[in-house]
Each structure stands twice: as C-alpha cells, then as structure tokens.
C-alpha cells in the first residue's frame, strides 16, 4: 500500500435545500484506470462511511446502496454532492481515494471538509 496526497476544502456550507458540494482532488502517481472514492463522516464519537463509488477513469461514478451522494469525475478530481442534509448532519466529511487498478495500490485520505448545515426557518403564516 502506497500513500497518496488528497486535497479537499476545509469548510463548506450546505445550501438551504440541504445540499453540499465539494471537490476531492488526488495526486495520482500513475495512470489509474479504476478508482474507488469513499466519503466518511467523523462526528458524534463515530466514523461512518456515508457513501462509496468505484469508477473507471472517464466514466461516471456509480454509488452503492440508496445513496445520498452523487458525483462526477474529471481527471484527478472528483466533484462530490451530498443531498438531504439537515442541521444534525453537520460534521467532518473525509474523502478517501483508492487507486485500485493497475497495481500498485495507492491510498489517500484527505483532512476532511467541515460541512455546516443550517435548517431553514419555516415560512411565517401569511394573510395573503
């Protein structure tokens, strides 16, 4: 297993609709054809894999399960979007990148993006 640098923004504010997007960029030492990207959430005394996708370079990301994540790839960048977030989902979201094929296997883990989610205020009743 060889180490690889992964960069991601320090802070992102989710939209009022509970959507947060950020870029995860990895310094690929070679020409990987198969890449696995995992988003982990570190908060509340636990570490959870939120979603994961394996993709072939040049193809779109396919996420596992009924995922709250979507994403696209461009070169060594992955554009990740997490949907359906609420205030309680605020936390540190870490990007983990694995170069699966061809060998050697590379692993990189980012420092994390602190995603802040603010629940929208309910609209006040209107007389109109």
């Amino acid at each position: 297993c060889k180490a690889m640098h992964v960069a991601q923004p320090a802070v992102v504010l989710a939209s009022s609709r509970g959507i947060a997007s950020f870029v995860c960029e990895y310094a690929s030492p070679g020409k990987a054809t198969e890449v696995r990207v995992t988003v982990l959430r570190q908060a509340d005394s636990q570490v959870t894999e939120v979603c994961a996708a394996t993709y072939m370079m040049g193809n779109e990301l396919t996420f596992l399960d009924d995922s709250i994540c979507t994403g696209t790839s461009s070169g060594n960048q992955v554009n990740l979007t997490i949907q359906g977030l609420r205030a309680m989902d605020t936390g540190l979201y870490i990007c983990k990148v694995e170069l699966m094929y061809p060998p050697p296997y590379y692993l990189g883990i980012g420092n994390g993006t602190q995603i802040y989610v603010i629940d929208p205020e309910p609209c006040p009743d209107s007389d109109f």
Partner: nanobody
C-alpha cells in the same frame, strides 16, 4: 421474522483477539443493515459497529483500527473481528438487524434495529 444467534465470545487476555459471528435466519439478510452493540454491567447498551447491505461500515471511535465488521451474504452471517482487546471491551455483545436507508445518524440508534440476538459474553482480563 428474523432470528439472530451470536457466537464466538469468551475469556481472553488483554491484547488478544476474538471473532464474533452472528447467524441470521428467517429474512432477506442481504437487505438488512447489521449492527453490533455491547452492554457492560451497570451501563447502557452502546453502539460498536455497523455494516450496510453493500458493505459500507461505521465504527465507534474507540474501536477504530482494532475492530473490523464484515458480512457474508451467502452465509447470512455478520462478523466482528476484535483485535488488541482491552479490559474496557468487557461486555455482552449483541447483534442487531434493521431495514432503513443507510445514514450516519441512524447506525448507532438502538431504535432503528428491529431484531436482536440474545448476546454473547466477551471478558477481557488484564
């Protein structure tokens, strides 16, 4: 109705290893999120680890790097490999199953799991 039967507990010295197994029957195992919880004497039941139907995982901070959860959908079994055990890991360990969309906020909530095993005792001596 899903039945869960745990095995693999026992007495081990600090620093040792155990592998817990949880065999499921009576349901579509591959569609369930599976969790391990533990309860020490006089304490509340607490989350240890969980795994989604496709293999996404979640761990309590204090077990990261020591415990590994995995599943074999062909054998309807979930495993908890516990290495570098500490006396504070002493507890009855329970297996649980639940059907819901995978979410970091749900994995550790006892109420999200519909089915529970009877538990297996893990004792770590110093």
């Amino acid at each position: 109705e899903v039945q869960l039967v745990e095995s693999g507990g026992g007495l081990v010295q600090a620093g040792g290893s155990l592998r817990l197994s949880c065999a499921a029957s009576g349901g579509t195992f591959s569609s369930y999120a599976m969790g391990w919880f533990r309860q020490a004497p006089g304490k509340e039941r607490e989350f240890v680890a969980a795994i989604s139907p496709s293999g996404l995982t979640s761990y309590k901070d204090s077990v990261v790097g020591r415990f590994t959860i995995s599943r074999d959908n062909a054998k309807n079994t979930v495993y908890l490999q516990m290495n570098s055990l500490k006396p504070e890991d002493t507890a009855v360990h329970y297996c649980a199953a639940g059907q819901w969309t995978w979410s970091p906020l749900r994995v550790s909530r006892l109420a999200e799991y519909n089915y529970w095993g009877q538990g297996t005792q893990v004792t770590v001596s110093s």
